[in-house]
Amino acid sequence: LPGVGLTPSAAQTARQHPKMHLAHSTLKPAAHLIGDPSKQNSLLWRANTDRAFLQDGFSLSNNSLLVPTSGIYFVYSQVVFSGKAYSPKATSSPLYLAHEVQLFSSQYPFHVPLLSSQKMVYPGLQEPWLHSMYHGAAFQLTQGDQLSTHTDGIPHLVLSPSTVFFGAFAL
Amino acid sequence: LPGVGLTPSAAQTARQHPKMHLAHSTLKPAAHLIGDPSKQNSLLWRANTDRAFLQDGFSLSNNSLLVPTSGIYFVYSQVVFSGKAYSPKATSSPLYLAHEVQLFSSQYPFHVPLLSSQKMVYPGLQEPWLHSMYHGAAFQLTQGDQLSTHTDGIPHLVLSPSTVFFGAFAL
Amino acid sequence: LPGVGLTPSAAQTARQHPKMHLAHSTLKPAAHLIGDPSKQNSLLWRANTDRAFLQDGFSLSNNSLLVPTSGIYFVYSQVVFSGKAYSPKATSSPLYLAHEVQLFSSQYPFHVPLLSSQKMVYPGLQEPWLHSMYHGAAFQLTQGDQLSTHTDGIPHLVLSPSTVFFGAFAL
């Protein structure tokens, strides 16, 4: 993977992909974040590793993406959950799994859900389970808006760069 | 569908969509591939049929999409799986279903997973089942990179143009 | 789109100096529709509420999106379904859930499926269930084409702006 075994700054440099050599007439803000696999009971977004990146003004603050300029963005996220069979001695209770992308804007004093996916899982004996959720859509966003995620079932996340991610790009 | 009942070349022509008649100031590489429904136990991508296409430099080689120019691309894929109930005489074993978009780059000697979705299915008596998986995200890719897919559960794919597809477009 | 509505020479100029503020220099047709939560047993798309919008020529017609200009579009949709446990006295029958984005062009006497997702749900005693479906892809569309959806399981839809939506944007 780009920058594996390199220092963070060298990894960043290694991941700078060649660009078309034209004057930047149209900046194209884009971001792709991955869930930090070293944090098992939380979902921390990272942009400085593997194939994750922040481009043309996107930045990360308090685990949220900051919208660099007003316009329409396509925003997306995926999570994968997994679980083992419950122990015969334990009670099998249903698991509510959910993942949501939220908008926090100075216009509103609360987080507005933009994208929501949900699932009920009923673990059984000898039955490991796996479940994937993906969603994405186009939204009119304002400079300074904060995009964040909320997840129910964090302990069950399969944290890898290809399974748990969050991103956006300007249209 | 455009070109239904036409020879392949006539179908191709029928599918040429009207374009804006301006010099191509901004080429927009894009591709949408569909799983070949005539190949039941493999997943072969096709771009010369139904609503599939390759535009502005994308090409298909060894069942992989070749990235035409360095930059950021949105890459996506979907699969739908289905299965019948297991026979009462047969043992019901869990089915592991997975679909992954992978990157093969001259930088690395292995396939890097970009997008992964997974599911465990437990077929039951008299219970036909259906499951859909979709994922997509933005990636920094380099000219010549190869995008391919790997699927567990290929015999269970519901191969139609609207259920099994793989595509990418430059941002 | 670059230079739409300009004379050829003005269009050329606009493309050589992308920062010139000419009308129609960068139209970006986009639409995001949400399912009307006040209509419980149908799926009516709305663009005049919450975070929904129609931009740069997208329009609605008979619950369909009208394609504003010929070109390649990314088209997407999501639905979330939910259900209660069946009553012990009632028979539990499998539920077929499906969501499809369709193209209608009067070239053909039928709706062409573009995106399809499907699921079989087997409601159990004391087991409420939830299921999400998402899909999206790039298609070559023609000015005036009609994009619509067809859903099996409408009474089970979780109608909220973040769970049930349908959109498209020009690439």
């Epitope: - | - | 005049n48 509420t49 929904a52 020529g57 329009s59 017609s61 070239q107 000015q143 005036g144 084409d145």
Partner: antibody, heavy 118, light 107 residues
């Protein structure tokens, strides 16, 4: 330069039919739909419907469905409006129009007057 | 169908005046509104699209604003060639409907 020229207007008896033509030039005919819009004398504008010459896709104002048929001939770069069962209130100037984006009527013909009278 | 109600139906103004025409939609139409200018015996001309964007070649004295149900066309300094009838049109859903028109006459 985009040009649209309508023809076929004139006096029609109530209950009769008309077929209007719209000859297009100055652009690739199959890249854009052709709309028909009408305007009764001293009144406002009313959208009738459109046809896409590329794939013959159509969309009509429900008010005219069943009475209006919009079609095109790619080989002649011409669009047509056929109206049946005409009544006095169909008296109007009929315009064809080519959009930039679908609902923006950017280019117009000069119009052709249809008078429905006995 | 969505109804578009224009006001006033006519107005008299002098060269150099600031003129404002309003259009109200019977339901919210986002920013999907266009404005047209029509002179006697001529076809209409597109002036404004998407509520506030001037079409190619339209002078900067023309501006549009509004979203939802209420829209405005403003001519900041009326010129002799601006005397005409102006129509608003909703582009939100078919059948795309026009307002009844506002005739701008010389005072």
């Amino acid at each position: 330069e985009v040009q649209l020229v309508e023809s076929g207007g004139g006096l029609v008896q109530p209950g009769g039919s008309l077929r209007l033509s719209c000859a297009a030039s100055g652009y690739t005919f199959t890249s854009y739909v052709i709309h028909w819009v009408r305007q009764a004398p001293g009144k406002g504008l009313e959208w009738v419907g459109y046809n896409n010459p590329y794939n013959d896709g159509t969309n009509y104002n429900e008010k005219f469905k069943g009475r209006a048929t919009i079609s095109s001939d790619k080989s002649k770069n011409t669009a047509y409006l056929q109206m049946n069962s005409l009544r006095a209130e169909d008296t109007a100037v009929y315009y064809c129009s080519r959009p930039t984006m679908l609902p923006w009527f950017a280019y117009w013909g000069q119009g052709t007057l249809v008078t429905v009278s006995s | 169908d969505i109804q578009m109600t224009q006001s006033p139906s006519s107005l008299s103004a002098s060269v150099g005046d600031r003129v404002t025409i309003t259009c109200r939609a019977s339901q919210a139409v986002s920013s999907a509104v266009a404005w047209y200018q029509q002179k006697p015996g001529k076809a209409p001309k597109l002036q404004i699209y998407s509520a506030s964007h001037r079409y190619t070649g339209v002078p900067s004295r023309f501006s549009g604003s509004g979203s939802g149900t209420d829209f405005t066309l403003t001519i900041s300094s009326l010129q002799p060639e601006d005397f005409a009838t102006y129509y608003c049109q909703e582009n939100y859903s078919t059948p795309w409907t026009f307002g009844q028109g506002t005739k701008v006459e010389i005072k």
